[in-house]
């Protein structure tokens, strides 16, 4: 096969029937009610046609149902982000029952032959869940599968497979070798529940991408361009755990959907909101910060189900570890002339003044090059709520910091030994919440300075016209 | 190995129904979705939709939405489509497909003739 | 729905020669389309899914690539019993969608 993983076998090679020995006595497919948040509480373990363990463990027929599912595993344990789910499940959902779907034996193989499986364990909780249905009061419309990696394909099988349609899935970075571009039936999409949303945290275009690039949800989530998650580089993976590797980055960024998903359910006062984009460069400008139309939506745990006619791709930013939220920023920074511009892009810095806090220093990403006569739409996010903007600081970086800029002022200067000062013109920034959906324009303090050059700021506040609404709903209305 | 055999060829009047069977050996006929895909004379390929043996579930094309019918009988491993209220133009060869990869298997195929 | 291109309808190669097919989704389908052969009077048979994987017992010499919405299938080097029709179908989501067909004949 031309790509590494490439999906091998036949349909007539699948036996459908685990890969551990045959002699066994355990299950290859267990279900775990956990009873306890406590992880050393052994629980109750359930069985088709079994109804005693329901009773014995206070099985809620009513209640909400959460299937959390592993996925390929190296060590054949539990690793530490389940026991955090299923505390941050029965913290925020008392009365739900909480099933681990244990399928290590299955899991602990080689990667090849652990996908070769997902389909008989998918098939396994399918199994369950019809044997659930026929119990008074239970509802598949209550279920909701949770499955990280490969355990998000298991539970697309599940659903698939299952006598009806469960009320959720949620794909927490479902694995990508041998699922990018596999048939509909063959991988998590959106025909296998009645809503199905997915968080993105390890693609990449280049290499190989541990994490599914392509959405396979009503709304697929991609936090920070769904590549590199920040709190995850070498270095930081390297401060913070001995002998750091890039196994350890890997594992790093391909949990965090995990963690992000855990964040909501324990942080649900500080939700994070992603934002609808065609694509990770155009959110990055900035173009994607609108609500209007089921643009934006919380993510993880209470995302608001849309069952759009074409999949959502949604984007935002997120901060290094939990709480996770930000708060975004479109800027528009219209530039009505150019002086002696040269080859080298400007490095501009915007510092935010609000009522609650005041930002830090935030550099403006360039994405493309910046245009004169024109609106340029930059994203800047903050840490912290800054409450109401009042006042807005604009620098434009002086010295190079980068040897590659500082050889293109060197060619430029070259060429045009006699260049006079750079210069930019900006009577006004406009400037959107993503939260708040509020739009505000802030004009130069002095009209008469329009201007700034290399290690130079230029100083805004709010325009007479003072905050503008637009019938835009905000998103920390709609939090259910 | 994997095979999907399909019933003989039928002729039928205008408005009639026909109902054309698939009958799957060599894989677990329940856990694979299987496709009724059409092909009039001289054309192109046509989804019309497909069934999960399992739990019945279907998918149709809304070209047929109405007409047709995709059902089966786990107990002898056999699909059957039953398309009604038949004209001229669904005048085709008929072909269940095993979908895995994709298109995996197909059937031998089944001539239907609609003609009055 | 989904809309597959396909192109040409029809081209007029001889044996040896490489041949490419071209199809055009409306949206992006990422890497989710599939190439099947058909000869007058067979099922068509699976060559290609996921855009480049090849299906067990297909020859080498068939190969697909694309991502996206532009797809191509080449036969790298025809062989005599390569002369058939060509479709290529997406398989991200439903309804599934085939080309119109490529005819590949004996020149």
């Known amino acids: 096969s031309p790509v590494p993983f490439g999906p091998e076998g036949r349909l007539e090679d699948k036996l459908h029937k685990p890969k551990a020995t045959q002699t066994e006595v355990k299950p290859s497919v267990r279900f775990n009610l956990r009873t306890s948040k406590d992880p050393e509480h052994e629980g109750c373990y359930l069985s088709v046609g079994h109804s005693q363990p329901l009773e014995d463990c206070s099985f809620n027929m009513t209640a909400k149902t959460f299937f959390i599912i592993h996925g390929w595993t190296m060590s054949g344990i539990f690793e530490n982000w389940l026991h955090k789910l299923v505390s941050a499940l029965h913290t925020r959902e008392k009365d739900a029952n909480v099933v681990v779907v244990d399928w290590l034996p299955l899991a602990h193989q080689l990667y090849t032959d652990a996908v070769n499986n997902t389909r008989v364990v998918g098939h396994s909780i399918a199994r369950m869940l019809d044997w659930l249905q026929e119990k008074d009061d239970f509802s598949l419309g209550n279920v909701h599968l949770i499955g990280y990696s490969l355990g998000a394909h298991v539970a697309g099988y599940a659903g698939n497979f299952v006598k009806g349609t469960v009320g959720r899935i949620t794909g927490l970075d479902p694995a990508g070798p041998m699922f990018e571009g596999a048939d509909i039936h063959k991988r998590l999409s959106p025909d296998d529940a009645d809503f199905v949303d997915v968080l993105h945290t390890y693609t990449r275009s280049f290499g190989l991408s541990i994490g599914i690039q392509m959405p396979v949800g009503h709304i697929d989530i991609y936090p920070n361009g769904g590549d590199f998650q920040p709190g995850c580089g070498l270095n930081d993976v390297l401060g913070s755990i001995a002998y750091g590797t890039i196994t350890e980055v890997v594992k790093c960024e391909h949990e965090r959907a995990v963690h992000l998903f855990v964040d909501s359910l324990v942080n649900q006062d500080k939700p994070s909101f992603a934002f609808q984009c065609t694509d990770s460069n155009r959110f990055k400008k900035g173009i994607c910060l609108s609500c209007r139309k089921n643009r934006c939506n919380s993510i993880g745990y209470n995302a608001k189900k849309m069952r759009n006619k074409r999949n959502s791709k949604m984007y935002l930013k997120t901060r290094a570890g939990m709480p996770f939220r930000v708060y975004h920023y479109q800027m528009k920074i219209h530039v009505f002339s150019y002086k002696n511009m040269g080859e080298i892009e400007p490095t501009f810095y915007v510092t935010l003044y609000g009522t609650n806090a005041d930002s830090q220093t935030l550099p403006l990403e360039i994405v493309e090059r910046i245009e004169q006569n024109a609106t340029n739409t930059f994203l800047v996010y903050t840490e912290e709520d800054l409450g109401d903007l009042l006042k807005i600081q604009l620098t434009w970086e002086g010295a190079s910091q980068s040897w590659y800029n500082l050889w293109k002022e060197f060619r430029s200067y070259l060429s045009q030994p006699r260049n006079p000062g750079r210069e930019l013109n900006i009577r006004r920034i406009r400037v959107k919440s993503g939260e708040t959906q509020r739009k505000l324009t802030f004009c130069t303090e002095d009209p008469e300075n329009t201007s700034i050059s290399p290690g130079r700021e230029l100083w805004f506040r709010k325009c007479r016209d003072g905050w503008r609404m637009k019938n835009e709903t905000s998103p920390t209305v709609e939090l259910p | 190995q994997v095979q999907l055999v399909q019933s003989g060829a039928e002729v039928k009047k205008p408005g009639a129904s026909v109902k054309v069977s698939c009958k799957a050996s060599?894989?677990?006929?329940?856990?694979?979705?299987i496709a009724w895909v059409r092909q009039a004379p001289g054309q192109g390929l046509e989804w019309m939709g497909e069934?999960?043996?399992?739990?019945?579930?279907?998918k149709y094309n809304k070209k047929f939405k109405g007409r047709v019918t995709m059902t089966r009988d786990t107990s002898t491993s056999t699909v059957y489509m039953e398309l009604s209220s038949l004209r001229s133009e669904d005048t085709a060869v008929y072909y269940c497909?095993?979908?895995?990869?994709?298109?995996?298997?197909w059937g031998q195929g089944t001539t239907v003739t609609v003609s009055s | 729905d989904i809309q597959m291109t396909q192109s040409p309808s029809s081209l007029s190669a001889s044996v040896g020669d490489r041949v490419s097919i071209t199809c055009k989704a409306s949206?992006?389908?990422?890497?989710?389309v599939a190439w099947y052969q058909q000869k007058p009077g067979k099922s068509p048979k699976l060559l290609i899914y996921?855009?480049?994987y090849r299906f067990t017992g297909v020859p080498s010499r068939f190969t697909g690539s694309g991502a996206g919405t532009d797809f191509t299938f080449t036969i790298s080097s025809l062989q005599p019993e390569d002369f058939a029709t060509y479709y290529c179908?997406?398989?991200?989501?439903?309804?599934?969608?085939f080309g119109g067909g490529t005819k590949v004949e004996i020149k």
């Open positions: 497909a095993v979908y895995d990869y994709g298109a995996d298997y």
């Open positions: 060599g894989y677990t006929f329940t856990t694979y979705w």
């Open positions: 069934i999960l043996p399992g739990s019945a579930k279907t």
């Open positions: 949206q992006d389908v990422y890497t989710a």
């Open positions: 996921s855009a480049s």
């Open positions: 179908q997406q398989h991200y989501s439903i309804p599934r969608t």
